[in-house]
């Protein structure tokens, strides 16, 4: 008996071939001997089976002695043995229909779990193997679970169902809802405008939800909400914003915030959360602001940084085109009685400059100039 695997919702074509290459009488029946379809001369006739409106044949193959049974919009319960009667012969085909669905929505938040459930006909014992977009293989029986979804799990999951040495392949598109970056650092000189961007790692037709940026300034004892906003069909509208600082927000995606001035009191880290409509949980992106200030007071040239810097960052003061006068893994460095000239304050990581501020030291009879 020939075994054919089908997919729920799909179309299957069961073949039946006569030895004569011409159009002759044929009938397809199910295991209960109920007629599904056949021919009467040149015409297709249908029986009283439950497949009536979903069963068809392909007339263009009849004159070659091929009499297929086509079943559209397959259901699990279409799994059965189908019998083709032609030329006093009976050809049996066993059809097994499987379905594979994601238990929840196929749009899942980063960190959530994905469960795939296999629907199969009674008496079958299939095995399932799924391959994620990043090449990770998972195996299982009726259900497969993947916990802690990551951004790289977004894309097409290919699942193969094996039964009777035959296989059928399912493709399920999974979208992991997350920001492109888990965290980012912005380095700015005091007084500069600061741009924070929060690009999403997915695109959907309509995006609705609400969000908030909480900020923990380094100098503050507690965090505070800097801005709250709504998102409706990818349009951003501000609900509430603090007076200090007075953030501005772009009206379109990607989410974009502007801080008019980088000041030491704003240096710190923030957490932008986005709650999407009809989703439990929130998307998070951490953002950090490091602010640099170079000053000269009397005979002391000082360079300071505020905000979350890593211990391996180096802060240096150097006269232009000369070796660093002072270089420390600290958040403040200074030079007493600096020579006249253009001094540079540099924040660097393994030789790569992250932030630079210049200050001109004039001869001792004049006051310093900050460009």
């Amino acid at each position: 008996k020939k075994v054919v695997l089908g997919k729920k919702g799909d179309t299957v074509e069961l073949t039946c071939t006569a030895s004569q290459k011409k159009s002759i009488q044929f009938h397809w029946k199910n295991s209960n001997q109920i007629k599904i379809l056949g021919n009467q001369g040149s015409f297709l006739t249908k029986g009283p089976s439950k497949l009536n409106d979903r069963a068809d044949s392909r007339r263009s193959l009849w004159d070659q002695g091929n009499f297929p049974l086509i079943i559209k919009n397959l259901k699990i319960e279409d799994s059965d043995t189908y019998i083709c009667e032609v030329e006093d012969q009976k050809e049996e085909v066993q059809l097994l229909v499987f379905g594979l669905t994601a238990n929840s929505d196929t749009h899942l938040l980063q960190g959530q779990s994905l469960t795939l459930t296999l629907e199969s006909p009674p008496g079958s014992s299939p095995s399932v193997q799924c391959r994620s977009p990043r090449g990770k293989n998972i195996q299982g029986g009726k259900t497969l679970s993947v916990s802690q979804l990551e951004l790289q799990d977004s894309g097409t999951w290919t699942c193969t169902v094996l039964q009777n040495q035959k296989k059928v392949e399912f493709k399920i598109d999974i979208v992991v809802l997350a920001f492109q970056k888990a965290s980012s650092i912005v380095y700015k000189k005091e007084g500069e405008q600061v741009e924070f961007s929060f690009p999403l790692a997915f695109t959907v037709e309509k995006l609705t939800g609400s969000g908030e940026l909480w900020w923990q300034a380094e100098r503050a004892s507690s965090s505070k909400s800097w801005i709250t906003f709504d998102l409706k069909n990818k349009e951003v509208s501000v609900k509430r914003v603090t007076q200090d600082p007075k953030l501005q927000m772009g009206k379109k995606l990607p989410l974009h915030l502007t801080l008019p001035q980088a000041l030491p009191q704003y240096a710190g880290s923030g957490n932008l959360t986005l709650a999407l409509e009809a989703k439990t949980g929130k998307l998070h992106q951490e953002v950090n602001l490091v602010v640099m200030r170079a000053t000269q007071l009397q005979k002391n040239l000082t360079c300071e940084v505020w905000g979350p810097t890593s211990p391996k960052l180096m802060l240096s003061l150097k006269l232009e085109n000369k070796e660093a006068k002072v270089s420390k893994r600290e958040k403040a460095v200074w030079v007493l009685n600096p020579e006249a000239g253009m001094w540079q304050c540099l924040l660097s990581d393994s030789g790569q400059v992250l932030l630079e501020s210049n200050i001109k030291v004039l001869p001792t009879w004049s006051t310093p100039v900050q460009p």
Partner: antibody
Framework: QVQLVQSGAEVKKPGASVKVSCKAS????????ISWVRQAPGQGLEWMGI????????NYAQKFQGRVTMTRDTSTSTVYMELSSLRSEDTAVYYC???????????WGQGTMVTVSS | DIQMTQSPSSLSASVGDRVTITCQAS??????LNWYQQKPGKAPKLLIY???SLQSGVPSRFSGSGSGTDFTLTISSLQPEDFATYYC?????????FGGGTKLEIK
């Protein structure tokens, strides 16, 4: 979102053969028959033949019998149509089309121009 | 082979017009008839199958009728994008055959 993507244009000499491919993407390829239809420049549509989903059943129009061969490779979701003993009147755009159960063609390839010229 | 004769072979009409194209089979083909639309340089597009069933995604201004030997494609109110060539196709017997086409042009 099934799509049929055909191979590129061909220029052949009379007497030669041409093999046009039709690759399916985005759906279950093995569930559908594929028909081939051609259209000579400025002319109407002409059915050439059909290959069933498993590839073990074909029917060619009498006009092309003996010159046309249709095959399918399920591993690559590709159907091929080979036409031999080409003549100038075989110059046409060749289309593959998904043949649904009542032999209506609901999805078509973009067409492959075959020019036969000495 | 079953011959399919379409009329008219060309037709001029204006946006908003009601247009009818006919197709005659050389023998009884039941309802085994399909209609296609083709634009220059493009593949044909299925509009109607089984004589009167509207293909998914096709605007409802297109309709098909008839059985036996005489069939009609009607466009109730022509839109600018409807100017194209229309073909009927019989699937009653092999070889499957198409009508010669009706070119619908802007008046």
């Amino acid at each position: 979102q099934v799509q049929l993507v055909q191979s590129g244009a061909e220029v052949k000499k009379p007497g030669a053969s041409v093999k046009v491919s039709c690759k399916a993407s985005g759906g279950t390829f093995s569930s559908y028959a594929i028909s081939w239809v051609r259209q000579a420049p400025g002319q109407g549509l002409e059915w050439m033949g059909i290959i069933n989903p498993s590839g073990d059943g074909t029917n060619y129009a009498q006009k092309f019998q003996g010159r046309v061969t249709m095959t399918r490779d399920t591993s690559t979701s590709t159907v091929y149509m080979e036409l031999s003993s080409l003549r100038s009147e075989d110059t046409a755009v060749y289309y593959c089309a998904r043949d649904i159960s009542n032999d209506a063609f609901d999805i078509w390839g973009q067409g492959t121009m075959v020019t036969v010229s000495s | 082979d079953i011959q399919m004769t379409q009329s008219p072979s060309s037709l001029s009409a204006s946006v908003g017009d009601r247009v009818t194209i006919t197709c005659q089979a050389s023998q009884d083909i039941g309802n085994y008839l399909n209609w296609y639309q083709q634009k220059p340089g493009k593949a044909p597009k299925l509009l109607i199958y089984a004589a009167s069933s509207l293909q998914s995604g096709v605007p409802s201004r297109f309709s098909g009728s008839g059985s036996g030997t005489d069939f009609t494609l009607t466009i109730s109110s022509l839109q600018p994008e409807d100017f194209a060539t229309y073909y009927c196709q019989q699937t009653y017997n092999t070889p499957l055959t198409f009508g010669g086409g009706t070119k619908l042009e802007i008046k």
